[in-house]
């Protein structure tokens, strides 16, 4: 299901989703001049089975030559939810994700691809903080959020993170141990939530990437 | 594992309170919705309500706002269920359960063992 | 408050025997957002409910494919095809589409 809201903002800080899962949308968008082909694909989403995950529809952008406005991608009325903007400054894709069940990896970037992501994200979705350059991270807990849900009702947990105006940069999705880190979340035949080892996986993951891997902002 | 840990049984006199607990294991409480529900002796089920232990936010079936207080402790991974000016109707079993979801699921998948309250005269 | 109404209050089955169990609630319990929170519980004596059906017709994890869920609107079902000793219980309809979320009055499921 989808979750209502964006993900919390904090002051000075970025988010990042790991990996996206099962249901997760992302819109079709072209940059300007540019269209999605006729008949393309409104979204792509994320779809697979117990032993994989993939993007289903691609997205595929024509010069719009007589157009000088970009087609908007307006979700279908159950899709209109979550709508995170996410500013893709050079495309890539980060390190493999495909070890989380479930889950997809970041998608390739398309060809004149708009300069911003919309995902659509899915209950069970977690996302990570760091402070942007010249802020250092203040940990009151894990730098972590989760859309989580009670019958239909949808919420972002508030992540336990303080960035302040030092000249520091830190580590994603955060360089100080929380004081209590997340516990392992119950698993079973199709759980959708990261495990403690899927945790471990993208801590391990993340602490072997570089600051500047990530180039893909979250605003 | 998943698992709820409720507090023990209770004996309580008319007009007093009673606080229980459901300690939470193998999850963290704040990235679920924690319900209790009342079962009194032979009876069926009552949603009494849920919490948010992230940030404290309740909602309450109107029968049991002013009965009931729900609260969350983050730290301990343990809810609370107050219950306030007891009566024998107050008697019952009360179950912690947490709505769990998955990809395509979700429900009350994991329930406390209970805790009985009893209030004598 | 949404009021669910089960019937039949209880239900006398042999073993291998088909079972049904019927759910009405007072109103439509479609959620805002399309989807019908209508979940099955069932709880044996001295133990907590579980869950065996979510969102009308879906089985959770580990529950035996002789239980099924069926219906729409207001009108639920709950059918075991061969009712085996460890089904013996009450089950309870539940909805979570309208706040409060509400119970049914249970079905006491025993053998004949």
């Known amino acids: 299901e989808l979750c209502d809201d964006d993900p919390p903002e904090i002051p000075h800080a970025t988010f990042k989703a790991m990996a996206y899962k099962e249901g997760t949308m992302l819109n079709c968008e072209c940059k300007r001049g540019f269209r999605r082909i006729k008949s393309g694909s409104l979204y792509m989403l994320c779809t697979g089975n117990s032993s994989h995950s993939s993007w289903d529809n691609q997205c595929q952008c024509t010069s719009s030559a007589t157009r000088n406005t970009t087609k908007q991608v307006t979700p279908q009325p159950e899709e209109q939810k979550e709508r995170k903007t996410t500013e893709m400054q050079s495309p890539m894709q980060p390190v493999d994700q495909a070890s989380l069940p479930g889950h997809c990896r970041e998608p390739p970037p398309w060809e004149n691809e708009a300069t911003e992501r919309i995902y659509h994200f899915v209950v069970g979705q977690m996302v990570y903080y760091q402070c942007v350059q010249g802020y250092r991270a203040l940990h009151r807990g894990p730098a972590e959020s989760v859309c989580k849900m009670t019958h239909g009702k949808t919420r972002w947990t508030q992540p336990q993170l303080i960035c302040t105006g030092e000249m520091e940069t830190s580590q994603f999705p955060g360089e100080e141990k929380p004081q209590a880190s997340p516990e392992g979340r119950p698993e079973s035949e199709t759980s959708c939530l990261v495990t403690t080892t899927d945790f471990q996986i993208q801590t391990e993951m993340a602490a072997t990437m570089e600051t500047s891997i990530f180039t893909t902002e979250y605003q | 594992q998943a698992y709820l840990q409720q507090s023990g049984a209770e004996l309580v006199r008319s007009g007093a309170s009673v606080k229980l607990s459901c300690t939470a294991s193998g999850f963290n409480i704040k990235d679920y919705y924690i319900h209790w529900v009342k079962q009194r002796p032979e009876q069926g089920l009552e949603w009494i309500g849920w919490?948010?232990?992230?940030?404290?936010?309740?909602e309450y079936a109107p029968k049991f706002q002013g009965k009931a207080t729900m609260t969350a402790d983050t730290s301990s991974n343990t809810a609370h269920l107050q219950l306030s000016s007891l009566t024998s109707e107050d008697t019952a079993v009360y179950y912690c359960?947490?709505?769990?979801?998955?990809?395509?699921?979700?429900?009350?998948?994991?329930w406390g063992q209970g805790t009985l309250v009893t209030v004598s005269a | 408050d949404v009021v669910l109404t089960q019937t039949p209050l209880s239900l006398p089955v042999s073993l291998g025997d088909q079972a049904s169990i019927s759910c009405r609630s007072s109103?439509?319990?479609?959620?805002?957002?399309?989807?019908?929170?209508l979940e099955w519980y069932l709880q044996k004596p001295g133990q907590s409910p579980k869950l065996l059906i979510y969102k009308v017709s879906n089985r959770f994890s580990g529950v035996p494919d002789r239980f099924s869920g069926s219906g729409s609107g207001t009108d639920f079902t709950l059918k075991i095809s061969k009712v085996e000793a460890e089904d013996l219980g009450v089950y309870y309809c539940f909805q979570g589409s309208h706040v409060p979320p509400t119970f049914g009055g249970g079905t006491k499921l025993e053998i004949k």
């Open positions: 919490i948010d232990p992230d940030n404290g936010e309740t």
């Open positions: 359960t947490v709505f769990w979801y998955g990809n395509n699921y979700a429900g009350f998948a994991y």
């Open positions: 109103q439509s319990i479609v959620h805002s957002n399309g989807n019908t929170y």
